[in-house]
């Protein structure tokens, strides 16, 4: 038997995809086990295998169909268990009613590029991935720059509380290397959070001319 | 600008069944959700269901679910409600509606039933 | 079925003044709360989403908030144009409820 702690967490990208960390204190590190979703009001379901991150804990992505198909909508629940073999039978570690629109967290943003560059100025695009039509324009976005010689960690928060696929940086130094990241985060849903960061998007300055300034 | 321009007013017997019309400009039809929304005298606004166009699919209040449904067709961008087995206590005014699936966005300027024998 | 209660049902309030309307869910919706403004002759209109988000121009002066299971809409300055019906709906359960409505008349 497997004892201690467990906790069983997953998020729903609003399209096709659920993802699941499973956390269990004292789990056995070699026990096959797995994510199986069965939808209140669908005719499919679906298992995936959890695969360790860490010393005691697991994730593995629920993939229900093309990564652009509106698979559920926010009538729906999800039971999800973790199922782990014992032997020859499959014992329930986990289960929760899982209401999708209520656990949101999309995928990060893709496709940042430069706009327009400055010696003092930025503007920046991106794209949102996977995003259910759903939202509407209803979508906040959390921007930071990463300046010489800090870390992400001390970059301040730029948020946009609206959907704004863009952004122009101000107060920029001259010739200098800069790095930008992004994320998005729906209104709906009492357990959504952040998305992931975007992957970074590296830019520089152009140098002020000399005697004057652009 | 995002518009519904919905039917005219209908006058409807008993037992009947009446179709709304709601066309609709402005955005991508085929990425919408249409609600359709009854507010009959004195009862306040209740909503009646949906039609998601982008998964093609339906959801109604179980109090509607026997009696209503809602169609699109994408090459018009034109949502339709339709009512059956008409009774005098659906004489309302019905509003088709575009949002999300939590609340509704724009509306559509009503269309008026009127159930008399 | 989750059961929205609004009051009061009418609210008297002279112009310039801050007019207070309240909506009580039966049981726990979150921030699951919307509110609509319905002038006569006109289709509802939404102001505010998920409790406190105003709709992009929404004028300022109106505003939600949240405690447990009761949700206010406050406006700050009354207009002339703000006497109206205004309905709040949730969209934790289906299916989706509206209050009866609170009634918002010139003193």
């Known amino acids: 038997a497997v004892n201690g702690t467990s906790q069983f967490t997953c998020f729903y990208n609003s399209r096709a995809n659920i993802s699941c960390v499973w956390s269990q204190d004292g789990a056995l590190q070699d026990t096959s086990c797995q994510v199986h979703a069965w939808p209140d009001r669908r005719r499919w379901n679906q298992t995936c295998e959890l695969l360790p991150v860490s010393q005691a804990s697991w994730a593995c992505n629920l993939i229900l169909g093309a990564p652009d198909s509106q698979k559920l909508t926010t009538v729906d629940i999800v039971t999800l268990r973790v199922l782990c073999r014992e032997g020859v039978r499959w014992r329930v570690m986990a289960i929760q009613d899982f209401k999708p629109f209520e656990n949101l967290r999309l995928m990060a943003p893709i496709s940042l590029q430069v706009v327009h560059v400055e010696t003092h100025r930025c503007n920046i695009s991106w794209e949102i991935s996977q995003a259910s039509h759903y939202f509407e324009r209803h979508l906040e976005f959390e921007a930071r720059t990463l300046s010489p010689g800090h870390t992400w960690e001390e970059a301040p928060l730029l948020t946009l509380k609206q959907k704004q696929e863009w952004i122009c940086l101000e107060t920029l130094t001259p010739d200098t290397q800069y790095e930008f990241q992004v994320r998005v985060k729906p209104l709906q849903g009492e357990f959504t959070t952040w998305s992931p960061w975007s992957q970074p998007l590296a830019f520089r300055t152009k140098p002020a001319a000399l005697g004057k300034d652009t | 600008e995002v518009q519904l321009v919905q039917s005219g007013a209908e006058v409807k017997k008993p037992g009947a069944t009446v179709k709304i019309s709601c066309k609709v400009s402005g955005f991508n039809f085929k990425y919408s959700l249409i609600h359709w929304v009854q507010q009959a005298p004195g009862k306040g606004l209740e909503w009646m269901g949906w039609?998601?166009?982008?998964?093609?699919?339906?959801e109604y209040a179980p109090g509607f679910q026997d009696r209503v449904t809602i169609t699109a067709d994408t090459s018009t961008d034109t949502a339709y409600m339709e009512l059956s087995s008409l009774r005098s206590e659906d004489t309302a005014v019905y509003y088709c509606a575009r949002g999300g699936p939590w609340f509704l966005s724009y509306w559509g300027q009503g269309t008026t039933v009127t159930v008399s024998s | 079925e989750i059961v929205m209660t609004q009051s009061p049902a009418t609210l008297s309030v002279s112009p310039g003044e801050r007019a207070t309307l309240s909506c009580r869910a039966s049981?726990?919706?979150?921030?699951?709360l919307h509110w609509y403004q319905q002038k006569p002759g006109q289709a509802p209109r939404l102001l505010i989403i998920y409790g406190l988000q105003s709709i992009s121009g929404i004028p300022a002066r109106f505003s939600g908030s949240r405690s447990g299971t009761e949700f206010t809409l406050t406006i700050s300055s009354l207009q002339s144009e703000d006497f109206a019906v205004y309905f709040c709906q949730q969209s934790n359960n289906f299916p989706y409820t509206f209050g009866q409505g609170t009634k918002l008349e010139i003193k």
């Open positions: 049981q726990i919706i979150s921030n699951n």
């Open positions: 039609i998601d166009n982008e998964a093609g699919e339906t």
